[in-house]
């Protein structure tokens, strides 16, 4: 007799989730010598322990503490790039500018990037059928709590000038309900972070508007200023040229505004 299973509104756990996490961990520790000491089996056990046998709407940051401890990593605090709704370009940027880091360039962010997972209360099974949706079901689900936890820690670790890449094509360039707007902005430490510099990425080829004057950017400026952190904003009119100039800064066309 098939056992009754809770039907959630979101997609189920990514197929081959345990194998994917383990494989990513092995790959990451091979590429990053400073993380070679990490025991990937222990990392998987801690990851699994955070959500297996627990109600997927009742996950806490505390559940992830063993994983956080195992994944402890020192990132140069003045080389942090945050992003909101523009992940691909942010990742392309740090692939070229190798001394800068997004959350997904850290071990824990790399392990979970683009994956979904959840378990079921009182059973050791992983739920591959469905997982809670943040809006329709509950916010304290395994995936949301994970990203909230690692994002908070990543923001708390930042210092000096912190950069954030924002999508200028969206109606809300700065969205206070995004992970950046709801978690990271509020966990930057004013005693450590000197300036938040926003890079607003333009989508349209002929878009010459100053998106730094957008009302949502003004809202971000206000939030940051109230926290006694300085604010700066730059328009990136040509993201393609921007990346090209990061690759080849000596190029003569890279002195003009991008």
């Amino acid at each position: 007799v098939p056992r009754w299973r809770q039907q959630w509104s979101g997609p189920g756990t990514t197929k081959r989730f345990p194998e994917t996490v383990l494989a990513r961990c092995v790959k990451y520790t091979e590429i990053h010598p400073e993380m070679r000491h990490v025991d990937c089996q222990s990392v998987w056990d801690a990851f699994k322990g955070a959500f297996i046998s627990k109600h997927p709407c009742n996950i806490t940051e505390e559940d992830y503490q063993p994983l956080m401890k195992l994944g402890t990593q020192t990132v140069p605090c003045n080389k942090i790039l945050l992003w909101s709704r523009i992940k691909d370009l942010a990742h392309q940027f740090t692939q070229v500018q190798r001394d800068m880091f997004t959350l997904e360039d850290t071990l824990l962010g790399y392990l979970a990037d683009d994956l979904t997972w959840c378990g079921e209360f009182n059973t050791s099974k992983i739920n591959y059928q469905s997982c809670p949706d943040w809006r329709k079901d509950c916010s304290n689900n395994p995936v949301s709590v994970f990203w909230k936890t690692v994002s908070r820690r990543f923001a708390e670790a930042a210092c000096d000038v912190v950069h954030v890449m924002l999508n200028g094509s969206r109606s809300k360039i700065f969205d206070k309900n995004s992970t950046f707007g709801s978690v990271e902005v509020h966990n930057l430490q004013p005693e450590k972070v000197q300036t938040l510099e926003a890079w607003v990425i333009h989508g349209g080829r002929e878009d010459s508007r100053d998106l730094c004057q957008d009302p949502t950017i003004k809202e971000l400026e206000s939030i940051i200023s109230k926290r006694n952190i300085q604010f700066s904003c730059k328009n990136i009119y040509r993201p393609d040229k921007f990346l090209q100039c990061v690759k080849n800064p000596e190029d003569s066309s890279c002195t003009s505004e991008i």
Epitope: E191, K192, Q230
Partner: antibody, heavy 116, light 111 residues
Framework: QIQLVQSGPELKKPGETVKISCKAS????????MNWVKQAPGKGLKWMGW????????TVADDFKGRFAFSLDTSASTAYLQINNLKNEDTATYFC?????????WGQGTLVTVSA | DIVLTQSPVFLAVSLGQRATISCRAS??????????MHWYQQKPGQPPKLLIY???NLESGIPARFSGSGSRTDFTLTINPVEADDVATYYC?????????FGGGTRLEIK
């Protein structure tokens, strides 16, 4: 190149007021806060506080609250330190230094002498 | 406030030898593995010059004879080999927690 240039030495009497300037060049002034550091003759360094050059919000260390004030003229990329009701123990060299919390850029220092 | 205790207060070293200056903080100055401890050199009549930031990062333009190490509460500035131009007072400074504080200084002289 980045430079912080401070105003010249001052000789003041007790009870008077002095205002020291620190003019920044070579970078966007409003991107980095400005700190003030005191060094009494033959003594060590003491952080007085800093001013947020974007908002103008000053943070004054407890030991300097009351007679010491930080201000800005953003259009001139200049930060100011004002000391009111000068006392003999205010005799010192005052440095401006650019944030972040480690100071790679310093002004040359302004010697303030308080003497009757 | 975080108190920084430097030792020794005076240090005399022969040219070409190693100089080691210690700085102990009254509480940890670490944040997620980054140590907010910095080192400066000051010569008479001049402003301090940043040598090392965040415990072990060599400031641009500073010779590699200068190095910094340590974490949490115990930090060391090493000069190896010492040159005549290194005669100065050296200060540690923390920016982990306001108010930022400096150590009392260490005067380096040549034996």
């Amino acid at each position: 190149q980045i430079q912080l240039v401070q105003s010249g030495p001052e000789l003041k009497k007790p009870g008077e007021t002095v205002k020291i300037s620190c003019k920044a060049s070579g970078y966007t002034f409003t991107n980095y806060g400005m700190n003030w550091v005191k060094q009494a003759p033959g003594k060590g360094l003491k952080w007085m506080g800093w001013i947020n050059t974007y908002t103008g919000e000053p943070t004054v260390a407890d030991d300097f609250k009351g007679r010491f004030a930080f201000s800005l003229d953003t259009s001139a990329s200049t930060a100011y330190l004002q000391i009111n009701n000068l006392k003999n123990e205010d005799t010192a060299t005052y440095f401006c230094a650019r944030n972040p919390g480690w100071f790679a850029y310093w002004g040359q220092g302004t010697l303030v002498t308080v003497s009757a | 406030d975080i108190v920084l205790t430097q030792s020794p207060v005076f240090l005399a070293v022969s040219l070409g030898q190693r100089a080691t200056i210690s700085c102990r903080a009254s509480e940890s100055v670490d944040n997620y593995g980054n140590s907010f401890m910095h080192w400066y050199q000051q010569k008479p009549g001049q402003p301090p010059k940043l040598l090392i930031y965040r415990a072990s990062n060599l400031e641009s333009g500073i010779p590699a004879r200068f190095s910094g190490s340590g974490s949490r509460t115990d930090f060391t500035l090493t000069i190896n080999p010492v040159e005549a131009d290194d005669v100065a007072t050296y200060y540690c400074q923390q920016s982990h927690e306001a108010p930022w504080t400096f150590g009392g200084g260490t005067r380096l002289e040549i034996k």
